[in-house]
Interface confidence: low
């Protein structure tokens, strides 16, 4: 079978910037690298029939199915799909290979099926069977990772009921603070569920899938660290897993540690110790509190009692629902043109928030910091100094909360005219917003020093601009002023600036813009 | 700022071969579709083809099949739309139109239109 | 080639008025489907894209739905400014035809 030509199939994902429908044979896409989908021959068919691997599109990918044929000569060919045939335009790449596309934009239900390619080429036809279905994202899920003690040892568990099935991952961290950032130095990541190592300072387990990422950050009370101004909180939904560690470093062994809720110690079975030797000798014993499912009566202070350490608490609270706590009336900003300054919410919320800053339809990602009093805080900062409406959107599983902001930056005004055969009328966008004069040029008055009073209407914030008000001057057009130059002003504390307009007939106008400071 | 800039209106005999050019900026030339449509005096808006302009892959609508073709300048963000074979009722304005996302969505950004005449 | 089909080819309407303009489809475009405004001597302008999503920068009066072979392109409350011709274009597959056209004239 020497002289059947050789066949690569291959799939191309675009990226997808959520923007494109329907389908087409005739161009590809900008695309990203191709992946081979095999295209062996398939075995007990009449003719030859090559068959790809089959291919799972996510709704709304776009995609590029692509032959390439390595014969000699010109070929011809036809796709069929669901009994309709489509236009086929081969080209030729440079290996001189020829090149069939089918480009489906944004897959949909009705664009999932068998593709058949017909080729034809002067030695041989054949046909080539693609076969695109829809992967099932409806049932995709991404939850947060929670904890179970490994049964019989002393290991924790990391748990993502999530679909597909996810990654875990620990990430742990022996330093205090800013040091634990994701991509410093003093992180370590393990790729596994398990985890035997429950002496570091910071331990958080991380699940990932197609859908993204989520992190669970074990709850620790620190008794060598100088305890927070304010107690630290935990907040739990009815039913999830509560886990609290409890850290002591000491000299020697000769202490122990205890767990109290509400000054009763907690029943046997809720709580599990695990002691080592540092390298400097020094004894850390760590004692974990848990309850597999909380209930509305596991609220209260969960105190951790040393014999060696002064005693800790955590305020836990059991919620029937998720929350976001912040003060949501809109505040407005004053700034000077080159000040130095930004937009901050504060805000308590369970579980952890998703946010957007939005400004002028464009949304910036969102950063969020824990405070020391259980707070968390977002600030934007990139705002360039353009003034205007700007959005910070949280939600969570079962709360949303928006706030709006809006920004002045005091300038002084800049003027824009424009006439027409009746009036004259002049715009300016300064802060604080200005107030209007208008002045007629004549022989007697060459410095424009006569003020115009009568006909004159100005009207303040005329249009809003993603919440940056224009304000506006129109002068009607009388017979004393016709054929004159006019000027209008514009003046706030900041300055003032002026048009010149040439009051003549209809058409285009000369202006002449003077800046006053 | 993001824009299409056509070339001059064109007047032309019948039989003879037009060439109309399209020059992007203010975006990343080749990240988008670039459509041809062209309207007759009073007449609607009938669709002429389409080219890619990372690849220079094209597709024509019928009508204009071997008539028509397509071709883009990647170094000078330019593409360009070549009649021939004119006849007076190719008197048309010619619009290029930038395709949104790749082409499933339309065009959001046009071109002012050449106008090309046919007349002996 | 997929066939559209817009109607009324004209309307005369008043500032104020909500007016609705169809586009049919002669088979199937799930949602594939523009619509444009034109004004005399200009370029067409993108209002509404994939059926119903509106362009930035355009005006909330406008509205757009529908979905397979049957659209609507509608206007809240019409100002001044929206006197124009408006035209439907399916982006199902090439060639991407266009509606005949819809004029909205000032009654």
């Known amino acids: 079978n020497q002289d059947l030509p050789v066949i690569k199939c291959v799939l191309i994902n675009h990226k997808n910037n959520d923007s494109s429908v329907g389908k087409s044979s005739s161009y590809p896409m900008v695309s990203e690298s191709p992946e081979d989908l095999g295209c062996a021959l398939r075995p007990q068919s009449s003719g030859t029939v090559y068959e790809a691997a089959a291919v799972e599109v996510d709704v709304s990918a776009s995609i590029t199915l692509q032959v390439l044929v390595d014969a000699p000569g010109n070929i011809s060919c036809l796709w069929v799909f669901k009994h309709s045939s489509l236009n086929c335009q081969p080209h030729f790449d440079l290996q001189n290979r020829g090149v069939v596309s089918m480009v489906i934009l944004k897959m949909t239900e009705t664009q999932a099926g068998e593709y058949l390619l017909f080729i034809q080429s002067e030695a041989t036809n054949y046909t080539i069977l693609f076969t695109v279905s829809i992967r099932n994202t409806l049932l995709y899920t991404l939850r947060r990772p929670y904890f179970r003690k490994m049964e019989n040892q002393d290991a924790l568990v990391c748990i993502s009921e999530s679909v597909p099935e996810p990654i875990v991952e620990w990430v742990l961290c022996d330093s205090q603070g800013e040091s634990c950032k994701e991509e410093s130095p003093a992180v370590v990541k393990k790729e596994e569920k398990v985890l035997h190592e429950l002496f570091g300072t910071d331990i958080r387990c991380c699940a990932r899938n197609e859908l993204g990422r989520e992190c669970t950050r074990l709850f620790t009370i620190d008794l060598n660290q100088t305890p927070q101004t304010t107690l630290p909180q935990l907040f739990l939904k009815v039913g999830e897993p509560l886990w609290i560690r409890c850290k002591a470093v000491h000299v020697n062994h000769g202490f122990g540690l205890t767990w109290e809720l509400e000054n009763k110690a907690l029943e046997e079975g809720n709580y599990f110790e695990m002691s080592t030797y540092s390298t400097n000798r020094t004894m850390i014993r760590i004692l974990f509190a848990f309850v597999s499912s909380v209930a509305r009566n596991d609220t209260g202070y969960y105190t951790c009692s040393s014999s060696k350490h002064p005693s800790q608490s955590a305020l836990v609270t059991i919620v029937e629902k998720g929350f976001i706590n912040a003060t949501n009336s809109s505040e407005d900003y004053e700034i000077d043109q080159y000040e130095e300054f930004c937009f901050s919410v504060r805000f308590k919320a369970y579980p952890q928030i998703r946010c957007t800053w939005t400004f002028s339809r464009k949304s910036f990602p969102c950063e969020q910091k824990g405070l020391d009093n259980g707070y968390s805080i977002s600030k934007f900062c990139n705002h360039k100094h353009q003034p205007g409406e700007y959005i910070f959107h949280a939600e969570n599983d079962d709360a949303q909360f928006t706030k709006m902001f809006t920004l002045n930056i005091r300038r002084k005004p800049q003027v824009l005219a424009e006439a027409s055969a009746s009036q004259a009328s002049c715009f300016s966008d300064g802060y604080p917003l200005p107030s209007w004069t208008w002045k007629k040029c004549s022989d007697k008055s060459p410095n424009c020093t006569e003020e115009i009073t009568e006909g004159v209407w100005n009207r303040k914030a005329n249009r809003k601009v993603f919440g940056q008000w224009v304000s506006s001057s129109t002068l009607n057009m009388s017979e004393a002023i016709k054929g004159f130059l006019v000027k209008c002003c514009a003046y706030n504390s900041l300055g003032t600036s002026c048009e010149t307009i040439l009051l003549n007939s209809p058409g285009p106008f000369p202006f002449i813009q003077d800046n006053i400071s | 700022q993001v824009q299409l800039v056509q070339s001059g209106a064109e007047v032309k005999k019948p039989g003879a071969s037009v060439k109309v050019s399209c020059k992007a900026s203010?975006?990343?030339?080749?990240?988008?579709?670039m459509h041809w449509v062209r309207q007759a005096p009073g007449q609607g808006l009938e669709w002429m083809g389409i080219i890619n302009p990372s690849g220079g892959s094209t597709s024509y609508a019928q009508k204009f099949q071997g008539r028509v073709t397509m071709t883009r300048d990647t170094s000078t963000s330019t593409v360009y739309m070549e009649l021939s074979s004119l006849r007076s009722e190719d008197t048309a304005v010619y619009y290029c139109?930038?395709?949104?996302?790749?082409?499933?969505?339309?065009?959001?950004?046009w071109g002012r239109g050449t106008l090309v005449t046919v007349s002996s | 080639d997929i066939q559209m089909t817009q109607s009324p080819s004209s309307l005369s309407a008043s500032v104020g008025d909500r007016v609705t303009i169809t586009c049919r489809a002669s088979?199937?475009?799930?949602?594939?489907l523009a619509w444009y405004q034109q004004k005399p001597g200009k370029a067409p302008k993108l209002l509404i894209y994939?059926?119903?999503s509106l362009q930035s920068g355009v005006p909330s009066r406008f509205s757009g739905s529908g979905s397979g072979t049957d659209f609507t392109l509608t206007i809240s409350s019409l100002q001044p400014e929206d006197f124009a011709t408006y035209y439907c274009q399916q982006s199902h597959s090439p060639p991407y035809t266009f509606g005949q056209g819809t004029k909205l004239e000032i009654k």
């Open positions: 088979q199937g475009i799930s949602n594939s």
């Open positions: 139109a930038r395709g949104v996302g790749y082409s499933g969505y339309g065009a959001d950004l």
């Open positions: 203010g975006y990343t030339f080749t990240n988008y579709y």
């Open positions: 994939a059926a119903s």
